[in-house]
């Protein structure tokens, strides 16, 4: 008799990552009967919503539904119709919305309210939209990468099925860089976490984890740039800002009102004798690096050791996965290879920043000029943050792995968020049972 294929017994889940600069929709899929196994959930689609982050719609909230349509429609196409009603949809908003909430809780609530109403119109099982905390963002990022790397599996393997995998069950630390915040999360080595706010306890698959995490609001790459500009314009003698973080020959006019729009620049705010100023790039890595370091207050630390701004940071331990903008920026700069030393990265950044703007524009014609102009700053910022902010060294640099995807799934907080909300990470190790009846044909 001919074997007839049984209908695939699978489940789907959707998570929207509403970041400060854009929104991405992720569709996940897993075998229904293996929900509690580690490593079975994988991403089948990412749809990047065209346009800015949801916080930019604060003055036109009625258009949020239009903005989300294409990606939600894409989800309807990808997920079989029979599964629509049981597919959960979650939206998590991160630091862009945290900043909006700091400015106005009412406006942030209004944005989320319209998001919820828009997403409720689709045939899925909408589970809510909320602003996740920085601590959650760090924790879920850590869960995601370790889940995908197979670190929670108790079965020891003699072969490696994923990149970066060592046979030990040592978890990877997680380094996440967004537009408005950055997170560092890892298991310290037998070190007490001196500040309770930075301590997380998990029991996953029968094992306890004491995890350190911190989210630095305003230290994502976009908000760090606004901070730097606000700091530097304070000491400019006129409305020209000669900026080492932009390529020689680059020019851009900035409105002072835009500069002071974000809560991240409040500490640098002052009355300026002009409404606009012009950035003129001079393309000098060393000077750019020095300017960025002034954003990190390292003069005060109430703990045994700190990252910056008085925030406790235990000694770094083990390997780290650096993802999101850490990866995108370094990928653009062609610096993600495991073989590239920190000294080499610095050298390459010096050369890149010194390249004339006209030359850069010609070399990267397909890249939006706004993004293209900021890679010198972003690359320099990443080095400054990792080396001076988090205290990586030339030696420990080799423990940083710039990761975009693991096993086809994007590294980021969304998978961990969904695994948690769908109760797919058991506290105890599931008992290994014989084949279920559904396996027999």
């Amino acid at each position: 008799t001919q074997n007839k294929a049984l209908p695939e017994n699978v489940k789907y889940g959707i998570v929207l990552d509403a970041g400060s600069s854009h929104t991405s929709l992720y569709i996940y899929k897993w075998p229904a009967e293996k929900e509690n196994d580690t490593g079975v959930v994988h991403q089948v689609e990412e749809c990047r919503v065209k346009g800015p982050g949801i916080s930019k719609f604060v003055q036109k909230v009625n258009e949020i539904g239009i903005y989300l349509t294409d990606c939600m429609e894409r989800a309807r196409e990808v997920i079989p119709r029979s599964q629509h009603q049981e597919t959960p949809v979650y939206l998590g908003a991160t630091a862009g919305m945290r900043l909006l909430r700091m400015e106005s809780e009412e406006l942030a609530d209004r944005v989320l309210d319209v998001v919820e109403r828009s997403l409720s119109n689709y045939p899925f099982d909408f589970q809510g939209a909320r602003i996740i905390t920085g601590q959650e963002e760090g924790a879920y990022g850590w869960i995601t990468i370790n889940y995908l790397l197979g670190k929670f599996s108790q079965k020891t393997r003699w072969f490696s099925i994923v990149p970066y995998e060592t046979n030990n069950q040592e978890t990877f630390g997680a380094l996440d860089l967004g537009g408005a915040s950055t997170q560092v999360t890892f298991v310290p080595q037998n070190q007490t976490i001196e500040s309770p706010d930075n301590a997380l306890q998990f029991r996953l698959y029968g094992k306890d984890y004491n995890v350190y995490t911190h989210s630095f609001l305003c230290y994502g790459k976009d908000q760090a740039l606004w901070q730097k500009l606000a700091k530097d314009i304070q000491v400019a003698s006129n409305e020209i800002l000669r900026d080492p973080c932009f390529h020689p020959g680059y020019k851009k006019v900035v409105n002072v009102s835009d500069l002071y729009k974000t809560p991240c620049t409040k500490r640098f705010e002052m009355t300026l004798p002009f409404q606009q100023f012009e950035i003129q790039g001079i393309g000098n890595y060393q000077q750019c690096h020095q300017s960025i370091l002034e954003l990190f207050n390292t003069s005060y630390c109430p703990y045994s050791q700190c990252a910056f701004n008085g925030i406790f940071l235990p000694p770094l331990q083990g390997d780290f996965g650096a993802f999101s903008a850490f990866y995108f920026v370094m990928k653009f700069l062609n610096l993600t290879s495991e073989k590239v030393s920190q000294e080499k990265v610095t050298e390459m950044m010096k050369k890149f920043c010194a390249q004339p703007w006209e030359e850069i524009k010609t070399s990267y014609a397909g890249v939006k000029e706004k993004y293209l102009s900021e890679y010198c700053f972003s690359g320099t910022y990443i080095l400054s943050l990792l080396l001076q902010g988090y205290h990586f060294t030339a030696d420990s640099w080799e423990h940083i792995h710039f990761i975009g995807k693991i096993q086809g799934s994007d590294a980021g907080w969304t998978l961990g968020y969904m695994l948690n909300l769908t109760n797919m990470i058991p506290a105890e190790q599931p008992l290994s049972t014989p084949l279920s009846h559904s396996t027999y044909v």
Partner: antibody, heavy 121, light 111 residues
Framework: QVQLLQSGAEVKKPGATVKISCKVS????????VHWVRQPPEQGLEWIGK????????KFDPKFQGRLTITADTSKNTAYLELSSLRSEDTAVYYC??????????????WGQGTLLTVSS | DIVLTQSPATLALSVGQRATLSCRAS??????????MNWFQQKPGQPPRLLIY???NQGSGIPARFSGSGSGTDFTLTINPLESEDFAVYYC?????????FGPGTKLEIK
């Protein structure tokens, strides 16, 4: 500023294939959709199809099924429309267009200057 | 396919007057709480220009005298007051489902 520069006018024989390009400057095509619209002489507008250059998903009018290919080369920031088995009724001005939200949540639209395709024996 | 009908085919008005252009769809173009109806203006020898998207939202840089309304199957583009540069052909387009269809157009001419 954003500019869409289309390739020049084409004269083709029935049954031939044409490939029209749309080169975008000042904006990354990955950040929006590229639409193709045509307009026969002295007639109205007709939507042909669109592409999402970020993932090459395309949607188009089924009446072009088997004859139409819409592609994009993000490294060149250029979109392409290829139409085969040409017939006289394909004679039209072909436009590429971008529309969607920009970084400040303003809804923009940008159009190419148009490419006149004449199909004649 | 969704068929769009525009009326009138031609409209002759003077500068300063109000123009009301209508577009009717063969079936509802509403979905997910949104009306997927757009309006374009086209002048001779030029590409079209987006005026209104999602029934009532103004495109970037479009003057406030252009407004859109309607839902379901019946939509209206209003231009008030008319200015000399507004005399052109106006098309409605639905983007609810593929193929995104255009109406046949309304020609707005000077009286």
């Amino acid at each position: 500023q954003v500019q869409l520069l289309q390739s020049g006018a084409e004269v083709k024989k029935p049954g031939a294939t044409v490939k029209i390009s749309c080169k975008v400057s000042g904006f990354s095509i990955k950040d929006t959709y590229v639409h193709w619209v045509r307009q026969p002489p002295e007639q109205g507008l007709e939507w042909i199809g669109k592409i999402d250059p970020a993932n090459v998903n395309t949607k188009f009018d089924p009446k072009f099924q088997g004859r139409l290919t819409i592609t994009a080369d993000t490294s060149k920031n250029t979109a392409y429309l290829e139409l085969s088995s040409l017939r006289s009724e394909d004679t039209a001005v072909y436009y590429c267009a971008l529309y969607g939200y920009d970084d400040d949540a303003y809804y923009f639209d940008y159009w190419g200057q148009g490419t006149l395709l004449t199909v004649s024996s | 396919d969704i068929v769009l009908t525009q009326s009138p085919a031609t409209l002759a008005l003077s500068v300063g007057q109000r123009a009301t252009l209508s577009c009717r769809a063969s079936e509802s173009v509403d979905n997910y709480g949104i009306s997927f109806m757009n309006w374009f203006q086209q002048k001779p020898g030029q590409p079209p220009r987006l005026l209104i998207y999602a029934a009532s939202n103004q495109g970037s840089g479009i003057p406030a005298r252009f407004s859109g309304s309607g839902s379901g199957t019946d939509f209206t583009l209003t231009i008030n007051p008319l200015e000399s540069e507004d005399f052109a052909v106006y098309y409605c387009q639905q983007s609810k489902e593929v193929p995104y269809t255009f109406g046949p157009g309304t020609k707005l001419e000077i009286k």
